[in-house]
């Protein structure tokens, strides 16, 4: 009777038709399952847990980008239940490889210890891993992260470095 219902459809016994599973709102994720003709009796939507977000629909909640821990970047906008975090410029002691192709994690900051000479974010940095690096005053423009995050919204990111 319902073998042709779609991924997000359940079979409504009252109408004899496939029907859209109730979509969740922003900041929510489905609880239990619904789709391909069946719907759990207690199917519904629940709020995203802390550190996660969802744009709604049938998406599960996904972890916010870990700007500092993974990207080694500052937090421009912290994430909430409805939005991913936005990363800003690199943390002190880290620099951006501007022309490097983006991978699935966007653009990652690299340690100044590995930087070519005269890298602007690293100018004035003393050698040694425990050195105090100056801020990125030479980079007053918006970080590429503010563009990269838009392409990545809805995708999960690793929380560890």
């Amino acid at each position: 009777e319902y073998s042709n219902c779609g991924e997000n459809e359940y079979y409504n016994q009252t109408t004899g038709l496939c029907q859209e599973c109730p979509p969740c709102g922003p900041g929510e994720e489905p609880y239990l399952s619904c789709g391909y003709g069946t719907k759990d009796e207690d199917y519904g939507c629940v709020p995203c847990p802390a550190e996660k977000f969802s744009k709604g629909g049938y998406q599960i909640c996904r972890r916010h980008k870990d700007c500092e821990g993974f990207f080694r970047a500052t937090v421009l906008t912290p994430g909430d239940m409805e939005n991913d975090a936005e990363c800003g410029p690199c943390l002190p002691g880290y620099y951006m490889l501007e022309n490097r192709p983006r991978n699935i994690y966007g653009m990652v900051c690299y340690s100044c210890l590995l930087a070519p000479p005269n890298t602007k974010e690293c100018v004035g940095a003393t050698s040694g891993a425990s050195a105090n690096f100056p801020g990125t005053s030479g980079s007053s423009t918006l970080s590429p992260f503010q563009h990269a995050h838009k392409e990545l919204s809805g995708q999960g990111h690793l929380a560890t470095a």
Epitope: E1, C5, L17, E20
Partner: antibody, heavy 121, light 112 residues
Framework: EVQLQQSGPELVKPGASVKMSCKAS????????MHWVKQSHGKSLEWIGY????????SKNQKFKGKATLTVDKSSTTAYIQLNSLTSEDSAVYYC??????????????WGAGTTVTVSS | DVVMTQTPLSLPVSLGDQASISCRSS???????????LHWYLQQPGQSPKLLIY???NRFSGVPDRFSGSGSGTDFTLKISRVEAEDLGVYFC?????????FGAGTKLELK
């Protein structure tokens, strides 16, 4: 009197899209699902899908999932179907039909007069 | 999808004759709720389809009693006891037990 009034014939070019309307009157628009059915020239009937005017939820025949978009305007009690990337295979008469599902009776009890779509360059 | 096979595809009759149209489905049309969602529609020339019979044997409102439906499982029949001029057209059987709803190819009832 319950009526479904459909928009006039369409002559469209291959690759273009077309949007047809179905104006409902004489009953509670949001109380019944609106279905769309295709009838190719001299052929049988094919179920495209339906929309629930109450909440805009839709379900479509797998065959038409990339082809048809179903919408409604509750304020004007009008249902719409848009067909995109038209080919000669889309030349047909398109009917809207009201769906009755009370007391486990499931059928199309009222049909529009149909809109003829001709795809030709 | 459930395939609905109608026979004959053309049925020449004289007015006053009895007519019989057969419809066979590729799967049983008995729903898990016990109902059998086999319907008959008539499409008169230049018009949209109209419901005649629903759930095998129930005449829709305003349908004359010369129309009757019967059958079960996968085999169904529509009978017209005495054909009148207004009965001419194409008859479609349709199932709504399984998703998606499907229709037969149609039987054209025409004068000899």
């Amino acid at each position: 009197e319950v009526q479904l009034q459909q928009s006039g014939p369409e002559l469209v070019k291959p690759g273009a899209s077309v949007k047809m309307s179905c104006k409902a009157s004489g009953y509670s628009f949001t109380g019944y699902n609106m279905h769309w059915v295709k009838q190719s020239h001299g052929k049988s009937l094919e179920w495209i899908g339906y929309i629930d005017p109450y909440n805009g939820a839709t379900s479509k025949n797998q065959k038409f999932k990339g082809k048809a978009t179903l919408t409604v305007d509750k304020s004007s009690t009008t249902a719409y179907i848009q067909l995109n990337s038209l080919t000669s295979e889309d030349s047909a008469v398109y009917y809207c039909a009201r769906y009755y599902y009370g007391d486990y009776h499931w059928y199309f009890d009222v049909w529009g007069a149909g809109t003829t779509v001709t795809v030709s360059s | 999808d459930v395939v609905m096979t109608q026979t004959p595809l053309s049925l020449p009759v004289s007015l006053g004759d009895q007519a019989s149209i057969s419809c066979r489905s590729s799967q049983s049309l008995v729903h898990s709720n016990g109902n059998t969602y086999l319907h008959w529609y008539l499409q008169q020339p230049g018009q949209s389809p109209k419901l005649l019979i629903y759930k095998v044997s129930n005449r829709f409102s305003g349908v004359p009693d010369r129309f009757s439906g019967s059958g079960s499982g996968t085999d169904f029949t529509l009978k017209i006891s005495r054909v009148e001029a207004e009965d001419l057209g194409v008859y479609f059987c349709s199932q709504h037990t399984h998703v998606p709803p499907t229709f037969g190819a149609g039987t054209k009832l025409e004068l000899k």
